[in-house]
């Protein structure tokens, strides 16, 4: 038996096996964002649906106030997709007018906040220049990776411009994490 | 022992532990698509390779008729990438002609069909405006997230335009799911 | 008990259960790339940070010389994101000059090398035309999927142009794998 050390036959020692079904897990889906104040030089955080439709939290993984709370230390797979949409980007207008051609951009960051550490840690970033030549535009940014997280850590999703987030459908913009 | 309740020493009680190797899993890869009829107002579904090359299904996860069949209730990570390619998008041609500049777009949807609901449920959507100024273009859309699925549910991948899907390589366009 | 076969009551037989915490896992993050020679007709491989910051390897998953070494056969989820950035792409300049309009492109490939097989196997590819009309541009390509890997397999990430990879932040460009 993997996870069982060799020991005298009268004494069995087990590694911490567990049922997969009781691991902390969450899938959160987009809701309409209410404008909130956010720190200067810090991207605003999205808030999320955690119960209705496809959204759920289970096994002590809780959602509160824009944060997913990590209930148990371990390795987690963390993911998010944010779909952005906007009108013609400033970039092309600026370019046409002969002004500097610094592109507009869209950015998603999955951030970890640890009480014992003063600065948030950026776990994942997806950033893209948006330089559409005309017309409305829309596009997703997807992120996902594995991280060693500690009990009490908090995860959030920050975006460069909350007004560009497509909040119309739960399948377009979402955020999740699960203990491996 | 996590997963073992406290009990009299002569009686051991276990949570439903299982070997990870026996969990339902599938990774499907792209094949050339044969034109098929699809419902009006519903994107066409892709069909897939399930045995050759990198593709596999295992542990009662079956592929049939464009669908991945979920053999056991639980939380699954579901993912897909579709690589699209096309010629200059209509968007730029329309724009040049001075007509309305609504962009072309490419869309991937991972859809769930369940026996308990008459409508397909869109689990994941990746949608992107395509407004290339000239030339051939190509780009992937990637999706992945965790969902609570029921035994008997069926998953498929729908796309906005089957003729734009790059079916040339198994690593460019794929679809998979695994029980967590 | 799932994973326990029926057997005489004095003899318990177990499926190979294991503690999740002892599974091979790695998350590697970008470092500045040193120019290295690479084979003609083969995209150059990135090298990675495996210890500092968010990066780690554990449970016999080792990183050496651009490769993640698979220590145990099984099904792995493998992922990578590469963020590219560049100046105005050639594509638009070529087009403006009336020359052929084949687009520039950016490509990421996750490749498996097996000692017993002469050719590397491309597991995942994300490829995108880059045809920006002006200005600097930047964008990520994300990949992730599940593969059946064998003990001794080696994984690497190849890119079409190493000079376009954004190596500035560990959250922008990364590579990981974990045994399911």
């Amino acid at each position: 038996l993997k996870g069982q050390e060799f020991a005298p036959s009268h004494q069995q020692v087990y590694a911490p096996l567990r049922a997969d079904g009781d691991k902390p897990r969450a899938h959160l889906t987009v809701v309409r964002q209410t404008p909130t104040q956010h720190l200067k030089n810090q991207f605003p955080a999205l808030h999320w649906e955690h119960e209705l439709g496809l959204a759920f939290t289970k096994n002590r993984m809780n959602y509160t106030n824009k944060f997913l709370l990590i209930p148990e230390s371990g390795d987690y797979f963390v993911y998010s997709q944010v779909t952005f949409r906007g009108m013609t980007s400033e970039c092309s207008e600026i370019r046409q007018a002969g002004r500097p051609n610094k592109p507009d951009s869209i950015t998603v960051v999955i951030t970890k906040v640890t009480d014992s550490y003063p600065e948030p840690t950026q776990l994942l970033m997806g950033t893209k220049s948006v330089c559409e030549v005309g017309s409305n535009w829309f596009q997703p940014i997807y992120l996902g990776a594995m991280f060693s997280l500690q009990e009490g850590d908090k995860l959030m999703v920050n975006v460069s411009d909350i007004s560009l987030v497509d909040y119309t459908k739960e399948d377009k913009t979402f955020f999740g994490a699960f203990l491996l | 022992l996590k997963g073992q309740e406290f009990a009299p020493s002569h009686q051991q009680v276990y949570a439903p532990l299982r070997a990870d190797g026996d969990k339902p899993r599938a990774h499907l890869t792209v094949v050339r698509q044969t034109p098929t009829q699809h419902l009006k107002n519903q994107f066409p579904a892709l069909h897939w390779e399930h045995e050759l090359g990198l593709a596999f299904t295992k542990n009662r996860m079956n592929y049939t008729n464009k669908f991945l069949l979920i053999p056991e209730s639980g939380d699954y990570f579901v993912y897909s990438q579709v690589t699209f390619r096309g010629m200059t998008s209509e968007c730029s041609e329309i724009r040049q002609a001075g007509r309305p500049n609504k962009p072309d777009s490419i869309t991937v949807v991972i859809t769930k069909v369940t026996d308990s609901y008459p409508e397909p449920t869109q689990l994941l959507m990746g949608t992107k405006s395509v407004c290339e100024v000239g030339s051939n273009w190509f780009q992937p859309i990637y999706l992945g997230a965790m969902f609570s699925l029921q035994e008997g549910d069926k998953l498929m991948v729908n796309v906005s335009d089957i003729s734009l899907v790059d079916y040339t390589k198994e690593d460019k366009t794929f679809f998979g799911a695994f029980l967590l | 008990l799932k994973g326990q076969e029926f057997a005489p009551s004095h003899q318990q037989v177990y499926a190979p259960l294991r503690a999740d915490g002892d599974k091979p896992r790695a998350h590697l993050t970008v470092v500045r790339q040193t120019p290295t020679q690479h084979l003609k007709n083969q995209f150059p491989a990135l090298h990675w940070e495996h210890e500092l910051g968010l990066a780690f390897t554990k449970n016999r998953m080792n990183y050496t010389n651009k490769f993640l070494l698979i220590p145990e056969s099984g099904d792995y989820f493998v992922y990578s994101q590469v963020t590219f950035r560049g100046m105005t792409s050639e594509c638009s300049e070529i087009r403006q000059a009336g020359r052929p309009n084949k687009p520039d492109s950016i490509t990421v490939v996750i490749t498996k090398v097996t000692d017993s097989y002469p050719e590397p196997t491309q597991l995942l590819m994300g490829t995108k035309s880059v045809c920006e009309v002006g200005s600097n541009w930047f964008q990520p390509i994300y990949l992730g999927a599940m593969f059946s890997l064998q003990e001794g397999d080696k994984l690497m990430v190849n890119v079409s142009d190493i000079s376009l990879v954004d190596y500035t932040k560990e959250d922008k460009t990364f590579f990981g794998a974990f045994l399911l």
């Epitope: - | 049939t64 026996d115 308990s116 609901y117 397909p120 069926k154 | -």
Partner: antibody, heavy 116, light 106 residues
Framework: QVQLQESGPGLVRPSQTLSLTCTVS????????MHWVRQRPGRGLEWMGR????????KYNPSLKSRVTITRDTSKNQVSLRLSSVTAADTAVYYC?????????WGQGSLVTVSS | DIQMTQSPSSLSASVGDRVTITCRAS?????MYWYQQKPGKAPKLLIY???NLASGVPSRFSGSGSGTDFTFTISSLQPEDIATYYC?????????FGQGTKVEIK
């Protein structure tokens, strides 16, 4: 035109096996789920079970599980119901129903009487 | 089994009246379905997912509710609405129906 048509004998002897076939047209059975529902005289509706035609996965009403079998033949676009050891209490109109991914459609029903 | 308790078992109303039928599930369900069955005919789906109108169904029919308590409403009863109406839950095994509400015209 989407259609579901139940067929089979209208009279079955007690202790025998009731067999009905549902033939579908106008849609791909593999895209959906096929159910059997019955309605006994003057009574409400009772769900008997369903099959996922593409792979043949079945789910049954536990109260009938020991007696009911649902199968499919996708080449003939047919789903079949077998109910063993019938009694007079199994006299009912038996409906074939499509669900999942498409609007629910019911067949017109097939009356089966159990009598000696 | 999830028991579905439908009330009333029958009702009589005038043309143009608002008619309400309730269905209570013995445990919470996410989706409720409402069917109409006319004499000698197969049931026809009217409402799915508690509140979605099935294709081709007149807008005078509506559904609401969540958890254990659900309501089906005919905003203005028409002569062609004479039928028996059933609620159904599709989630637990077995799928179960209410016992039906017979609607008649006064």
């Amino acid at each position: 035109q989407v259609q579901l048509q139940e067929s089979g004998p209208g009279l079955v002897r007690p202790s025998q096996t009731l067999s009905l076939t549902c033939t579908v047209s106008g849609f791909d059975m593999g895209d959906t789920y096929m159910h059997w529902v019955r309605q006994r005289p003057g009574r409400g509706l009772e769900w008997m079970g369903r099959i996922e035609p593409a792979a043949g996965h079945t789910k049954y009403n536990p109260s009938l599980k020991s007696r009911v079998t649902i199968t499919r033949d996708t080449s003939k676009n047919q789903v079949s119901l077998r109910l063993s050891s019938v009694t007079a209490a199994d006299t009912a109109v038996y409906y074939c129903v499509r669900s999942g991914g498409l609007p629910d459609i019911w067949g017109q029903g097939s009356l089966v009487t159990v009598s000696s | 089994d999830i028991q579905m308790t439908q009330s009333p078992s029958s009702l009589s109303a005038s043309v143009g009246d608002r008619v309400t039928i309730t269905c209570r599930a013995s445990q919470g369900v996410e989706y409720m379905y409402w069917y109409q069955q006319k004499p000698g005919k197969a049931p026809k789906l009217l409402i799915y997912g508690a509140s979605n109108l099935a294709s081709g169904v007149p807008s005078r029919f509506s559904g609401s509710g969540s958890g254990t308590d659900f309501t089906f409403t005919i905003s203005s009863l028409q002569p062609e609405d004479i039928a028996t109406y059933y609620c159904q839950q599709w989630e637990g095994n077995p799928r179960t129906f209410g016992q039906g509400t017979k609607v008649e015209i006064k």
